[in-house]
């Protein structure tokens, strides 16, 4: 449309000059550029009541370039689109629209979610966590000796944080009760942290039992089970076997 008008003006107007400015191949004093050099786009610019032809190295925002043998011209993107390769392939949508496969949408299709930062419809990303790391040594108040009941913990890492609609991460910390061989702390051993000492394996028949977290244990001065006789302890251990309680921060 613009191109044919430019060509018609060229035929009508006798004052066609070859010594043109700014990328014009041919031009006139009155109409400006009539045709452009290769790889340049012809566009009509309104100046007051007059339209003059200009040659641009790339189309302005909101327009895309179309090639023809005699002219390259700029054409407007769709109304909801800010930048595009053509009317069917938007690359950036106007405010309030989400880009998906070159189209601008009010809402994202089923199975996708809106990313309000990039203004795109993106795949829903679910949380991914690593395998559990090994259980820590059995400790009580940071010591691995001088007690019978303590706690041990294990952790796992978040590999992939979830997107807004993705599944939340499962617990990343787990703590449980544990029993170690009762032994006095050796000289210089008192107060040694669990991670600095090798963990003693529990005796045969001794069990572990999961607890909410280590804080709840440390807050009680004396664990009731320690007052029970061996007969009662055995009875409890059968009941408590394989109990596991997880503690976590929701991510």
């Amino acid at each position: 449309q613009n191109a044919s008008r430019g060509r018609r003006q060229r035929r009508m107007h006798p004052n066609v000059s070859q010594g043109c400015q700014g990328g014009c191949a041919t031009c006139s004093d009155y109409n400006g550029c009539l045709s452009c050099k290769p790889r340049l786009f012809f566009a009509l610019e309104r100046i007051g009541m007059k339209q003059i032809g200009v040659c641009l190295s790339s189309c302005p925002s909101g327009y895309y370039g179309t090639r023809y043998p005699d002219i390259n011209k700029c054409t407007k993107c769709k109304a909801d689109c800010d930048t595009c390769f053509n009317k069917n392939f938007c690359t950036k949508c106007k405010s309030g629209f989400y880009l998906h496969l070159g189209k601008c949408l009010d809402n994202c299709p089923e199975g996708l979610e809106a990313n309000n930062h990039t203004m795109e419809c993106v795949s829903i990303v679910h949380c991914e966590v690593s395998e559990w790391n090994p259980w820590s040594p059995c400790t009580k108040k940071g010591k691995t000796c001088g007690f019978k009941r303590g706690t041990e913990t294990r952790v796992r890492e978040i590999i992939q944080h979830p997107s807004a609609k993705g599944n939340l991460c499962p617990p990343t910390n787990e703590t449980r009760k544990c029993t170690v061989q009762r032994k006095k702390c050796q000289k210089g051993e008192r107060g040694k942290k669990g991670r600095e000492r090798k963990r003693k394996k529990p005796n045969k028949g001794e069990s572990k039992e999961a607890i909410p977290d280590s804080k709840s244990l440390e807050s009680s001065k004396e664990i009731p089970e320690q007052r029970e006789n061996k007969q009662q302890q055995k009875k409890r251990k059968v009941q408590d076997k394989q109990k596991s309680v997880s503690v976590s921060t929701v991510h």
């Epitope: 179309t66 390769f85 392939f89």
Partner: antibody, heavy 117, light 111 residues
Amino acid sequence: QVQLKQSGPELVKPGASVKISCKASGYTFTDYSIHWVKQNHGKSLDWIGYIYPSNGDSGYNQKFKNRATLTVDTSYSTAYLEVRRLTFEDSAVYYCATYFANNFDYWGQGTTLTVSS
Amino acid sequence: DIVLTQSPASLAVSLGQRATISCKASQSVDYDGDSYMNWYQQKPGQPPKLLIYAASNLESGIPARFSGSGSGTDFTLNIHPVEEEDAATYYCQQSNEDPLTFGAGTKLELK
């Protein structure tokens, strides 16, 4: 004249990352979008995505979206393609190309990527 | 995605004869009267080279023996008369929709 010069061949191990460069000359770098295309040895062509050097906006073919990243350095008129977590299937020739009015009119010479353990 | 099916996969043509390559799109690649279909030639060890843009327009510097036609979903590349240097693989490519896609290629050999 317009030229796109790509970095040399790459030999990398599975799981690693690679970054291929494409240096443009002979035109104003910010005028045209740069696209990347993958060609499995002697086979067909697969469009990876585009980047506008003027503002860094980029878009990807869904099948490459999670592992490919397109960037530009306008001060060096250079575009980059980074591919992460490489697998044997990523072994191919990668091309950069200028996109002018809906066609690829200038191409780089190609960068051969070989993923091997 | 728009799938482009090229046929034949390969063809052998004598010097001076006509080579015809077809490209069928799974949906129309036309919009507002423009056909977003391009044709490229690729020789071994080289990048693709643009021959035809917008279905029928010859890229500058490309010999007039190359011509393109078609609209909507059916497109054709013709080479006539075929010359020795035309031995190559030819690809069609659509620019109408995201993602941009290519045909699988047609290998042209000389008899």
